[in-house]
Interface confidence: low
């Protein structure tokens, strides 16, 4: 059900492209195609190509993206295109100028001197931005989101975008300086992952990140469960980055217990993040044979 045909405006097309990209990434990383039929992979890649080609129609001369060509470009949407395209680079042919042009626009046009990324044209489909929606810690949350996208494009765009390392450092400085004041678990998780990617989630910041977890297994705010799945997925990625394998199993267990398989209205970010995190877990966890994840089963498996 995650392999769908993308269509619509520059936002809807990304909503449609997301589940297919992340499903292929997950099945590739976890080597599970045989369960679903290897022949389905080619069809999925065709849909990703289609989504990519369609998205280019919403690329503006500045290299940024918007729902429509004549609409002001969105920081969040452009960063999200960077994130999805960076993941898709290993799946289909993606023009690095498209990807790195968007990165350059984010840095030159949307990053303030203090490192913050600003949004001047919010997306129409607010349901696609997940836990960033109505977030009163907007500067931190959006800066973390963009920073994660930039870091995922770093290997591809470092040579083409000279200002990329400096931009990443500056955004990291801002997150680090304001991290201890965060109130929302979602922002703690997303900013925690952005800092962990840079090796800067340590000391009091790491302590705050870990103690924000409810019952040591989830990063949760009152309200939508989808946002909690998304936040906990960011947190899991941070833990894997930190190689904190003692904290990992309860978190994976909680995500598994949510029985969240992606898809549905407003699920874009939760879908992307939960499958990205679980794929990374499959790659990084030291030993699936002994790690205890099977709470839903009375009998241990292996």
């Amino acid at each position: 059900h995650l392999i769908v045909t993308p269509s619509g405006c520059g936002e809807q097309n990304m909503i449609g492209m997301t589940p297919t990209v992340i499903a292929v990434h997950y099945l590739d990383e976890t080597e599970q195609w045989e369960k679903f039929g290897l022949e389905k992979r080619q069809g999925a890649l065709e849909l990703i190509k289609k989504g990519y080609t369609q998205q280019l129609a919403f690329r503006q001369p500045s290299s940024a993206f918007a729902a429509f060509v004549k609409r002001a470009p969105s920081t969040w949407l452009t960063a999200y295109v960077v994130k999805v395209f960076s993941l898709a680079v290993n799946l289909i042919a993606i023009d690095s100028q498209v990807l790195c042009g968007a990165v350059k626009w984010l840095i030159l046009e949307k990053q303030k001197p203090d490192g913050v990324f600003q949004e001047d044209a919010p997306v129409i489909h607010q349901e696609m931005i997940g836990g960033l929606r109505n977030n009163n810690e907007k500067d931190m949350a959006l800066t973390a989101f963009v920073l994660i996208s930039l870091q995922e494009a770093k290997d591809i765009c470092e040579e083409q975008v000279n200002s990329l390392p400096g931009s990443i450092t500056k955004a990291g400085d801002f997150l680090e300086a304001n991290y201890m004041n965060l109130q929302r678990s979602y922002t703690v998780a997303i900013a925690g992952y952005a800092l962990a990617q840079m090796g800067r989630l340590k000391g009091p910041l790491l302590n705050k990140f870990l103690t924000t977890a409810k019952d040591k297994n989830r990063w949760e705010d009152p309200g939508k469960q989808l946002y909690n799945v998304e936040a906990t997925s960011y947190a899991l990625l941070a833990l894997l980055q930190l190689k904190d394998f003692d904290f990992v199993p309860p978190v994976v267990r909680w995500l598994n217990e949510q029985r969240y398989y992606g898809g549905g209205y407003g699920s874009t970010q939760a879908t992307f993040m939960v499958f990205q995190a679980l794929a990374q877990y499959q790659k990084d966890a030291p030993d699936h044979q002994e790690l205890n994840l099977d709470v839903s089963l009375q009998l241990p498996s292996r």
Partner: antibody, heavy 111, light 112 residues
């Protein structure tokens, strides 16, 4: 430092029961299954069963069903194995592993 | 039950020389999740076993990289590139794909 500390050696009479312990430290107890393994003198290893410390779920080797009972006490991060109706065949060293290994508990059954 | 057969029974090696131990299973150890749950243990004289390798080829932390595990399906090998004095003991392979888990009979590595 990760450790599985097992209880000391025991000498028991045939027909009796024995309960040995395996106390985990240095890691989160519920994160890893605890396996129990038997090693008879100068012989290879035999898998007895496994317990999930999170919920107490167990799976046994058919050969040891009715012979071994696996339990855990989460509050003390300790796993237990009870062996009943002991015979000389049960004389062996018993290890717990998680995948770290305990130092073993020697059981001698003798009248 | 899956039978694990190790060869040789005893291996006499000169320090600094390579060593190789074979482990064959009576059924494929490839699990439905795509992973192969084959482990290698070392039991030094008078000590408890210690895991060296899991998932066929992944080294446990602290295990020297002179140890390598390889194989797939039913045939597996543990190699030591240059044997050192601390490597002596009994090596066991064991599988965690099928219940009950089963161990090989062991290979005793002695220093010539």
């Amino acid at each position: 430092e990760v450790q599985l500390q097992q209880s000391g050696p025991v000498l028991v009479k045939p027909g009796a029961s024995v309960k040995m312990s395996c106390k985990a430290s240095g890691y989160t107890f519920t994160n890893y299954y605890i396996n129990w393994v038997k090693q008879s003198h100068g012989k290879s290893l035999e898998w007895i069963g496994v317990i999930n410390p999170y919920n107490g779920g167990t799976s046994y080797n058919q050969k040891f069903k009715g012979k071994a009972t696996l339990t855990v006490d989460k509050s003390s991060s300790t796993a237990y194995m009870e062996l009943n109706s002991l015979t000389s065949e049960d004389s062996a060293v018993y290890f717990c592993s998680s995948p770290y290994w305990g130092q073993g508990t020697s059981v001698t059954v003798s009248s | 039950d899956v039978v694990m057969t190790q060869t040789p029974l005893t291996l006499s090696v000169t320090i600094g020389q390579p060593a190789s131990i074979s482990c064959k299973s009576s059924q494929s150890l490839l699990d439905s999740d795509g992973k192969t749950y084959l482990n290698w243990l070392l039991q030094r004289p008078g000590q408890s076993p210690k895991r060296l390798i899991y998932l066929v080829s992944k080294l446990d932390s602290g295990v020297p990289d002179r140890f390598t595990g390889s194989g797939s399906g039913t045939d597996f090998t543990l190699k030591i590139s240059r044997v050192e004095a601390e490597d002596l003991g009994v090596y066991y392979c064991w599988q965690g794909t099928h219940f009950p888990r089963t161990f090989g009979g062991g290979t005793k590595l002695e220093i010539r």
